[in-house]
Amino acid sequence: PHLRTFTDRFQTCKVQGAWPLIDNNYLNVQVTNTPVLPGSAATATSKLTIIFKNFQECVDQKVYQAEMDELPAAFVDGSKNGGDKHGANSLKITEKVSGQHVEIQAKYIGTTIVVRQVGRYLTFAVRMPEEVVNAVEDWDSQGLYLCLRGCPLNQQIDFQAFHTNAEGTGARRLAAASPAPTAPETFPYETAVAKCKEKLPVEDLYYQACVFDLLTTGDVNFTLAAYYALEDVKMLHSNKDKLHLYERTRDLPGRA
Amino acid sequence: CKILKCNSEFWSATSGSHAPASDDTPEFCAALRSYALCTRRTARTCRGDLAYHSAVHGIEDLMSQHNCSKDGPTSQPRLRTLPPAGDSQERSDSPEICHYEKSFHKHSATPNYTHCGLFGD
């Protein structure tokens, strides 16, 4: 999946299996990623588990779990708030669109989480105060989570290079470095660009991610995934000047 | 291996001030140099670990992005502590502790928010 970290780094990760997205003293988020096509290095999120840890007089420990085709509007115990404590309503789940869009407010830690199902896969977005992000007691075991550190270098896909080569050559697939086997041939580069432009008129990294995903999978739902990811940034990011992230020219040979 | 403490200090020093074109770039570069120094100091005990190499590559990447010079001033992290997680021995009759922004205003003007997102393939 594509990852935008707390420090606004944008990466495309091929991480497969279960990985910690957030792991601090208040909250633990784990994602499970699966290949989008058999033999593909590109992966997408098929499962998401969020554990809200027991916090003072506010909330009991609550677990939220979403999987492909199952986006519940409740915690696994069936409740929709933080339990029986005095401040239980400081943790709340709201269903925005049935089976497609859920928002979790954790006011006791100033945190908002948005989980969506777009097509077969899940998307995740969070707004969190800096000091909650940094509330990690054991940096050795907790500090390597993806939202903070990004993906390990050997788990990153250089999708900007992929995009540039696809654009420059008109090729749908890079022979040596393709992250996936051939996607449906009915999806030429120009069509991918047009479909992504419809939803994402600004040619930022979300637009490029969209193009990459369409070329990799041939699945138009990924256009919506990028679109909603950007919409969530607009809602959740505190710096409105940094909604759009752009490619770095040094990563793109042949570009001015 | 204390590399992740370096990461934490860097993160806390730069939160909200690391846009490539921002006026705060000198401050960001100073924080990056501190991060590089901290990382270098952990090399002996962390050099075989992923966290160390991620930090080293990340620093090189950011130095280049922000056109930071290797020499120059360094910065100190800013830190503020949150109440401890888990069960508190002290019962609170006021729900204020359960409203982060309200309790934050007692200490500081406004919290510094951050965003993380995951989508697509």
Partner: antibody, heavy 115, light 112 residues
Framework: EVQLVESGGGLVQPGGSLRLSCAAS????????MNWIRQAPGKGLEWIGM????????HYADSVKGRFTISRDNSKNTLYLQMNSLRAEDTAVYYC????????WGQGTMVTVSS | DVVLTQSPLSLPVTLGQPASISCRSS???????????LEWFQQRPGQSPRLLIY???NRFSGVPDRFSGSGSGTDFTLKISRVEAEDVGVYYC?????????FGQGTKLEIK
């Protein structure tokens, strides 16, 4: 809980070979450098070598250089020590240990080199 | 290679009394940045070594506060404020500042 379990020790003749394994659990194995350390009967500890998290670098003590090879399989959470051209002085308990600097150690496996 | 020399090699102590182990290095263990990478390990009889102290004076997680480390440059000390029965074993100093990393020869602590 961090657990390291060594196996593969035993009796081997001088000049022979042996491969030790170290199965890791309770931490993200692929994030850490790993060490092999040995202890001859009734003697002190001797560092043998270490391997980076991604196998990109390996470092060895002079006493085993050219004879011992450290490797790892991150998909199996396992560290290996291939020992060739074994000598009587290689007789020891062999420990694997987590981290660039060893913080957690396994229980060890005994290697006896004797004719 | 850096040689670490421990003394005494054998240390009989009365329960409840303090104990002190010295570790001397053949060259300074301080880096150019001012860090010193010296650790102490404990090996109880029949067990594998366990990290007690890292970077001269930092106690590793779960280590009782009766253990403390001090020193700089070439001279280092491990102190046990009040020896308990479970402290019996061999104690090793270990340096990471210079390649190759090296251990001291060990100090055997026993109860009088």
């Amino acid at each position: 809980e961090v657990q390291l379990v060594e196996s593969g020790g035993g009796l081997v003749q001088p000049g022979g070979s042996l491969r030790l394994s170290c199965a890791a659990s309770g931490f993200t194995f692929s994030n850490y450098g790993m060490n092999w350390i040995r202890q001859a009967p009734g003697k002190g500890l001797e560092w043998i070598g270490m391997i980076y998290y991604d196998s990109s670098e390996k470092h060895y003590a002079d006493s085993v250089k050219g004879r011992f090879t450290i490797s790892r399989d991150n998909s199996k959470n396992t560290l290996y020590l291939q020992m060739n051209s074994l000598r009587a002085e290689d007789t020891a308990v062999y420990y694997c240990a987590k981290g660039t600097t060893p913080d957690y150690w396994g229980q060890g496996t005994m290697v006896t080199v004797s004719s | 290679d850096v040689v670490l020399t421990q003394s005494p090699l054998s240390l009989p102590v009365t329960l409840g009394q303090p104990a002190s182990i010295s570790c001397r290095s053949s060259q300074s263990l301080e880096t150019s940045d001012g860090d010193t990478f010296l650790e102490w390990f404990q090996q109880r009889p029949g067990q594998s070594p366990r990290l007690l102290i890292y970077e001269v004076s930092n106690r590793f997680s779960g280590v009782p506060d009766r253990f403390s480390g001090s020193g700089s440059g070439t001279d280092f000390t491990l102190k046990i404020s009040r020896v308990e029965a479970e402290d019996v074993g061999v104690y090793y100093c270990f340096q990471v500042t210079h390649d190759p990393v090296t251990f001291g020869q060990g100090t055997k602590l026993e109860i009088k």
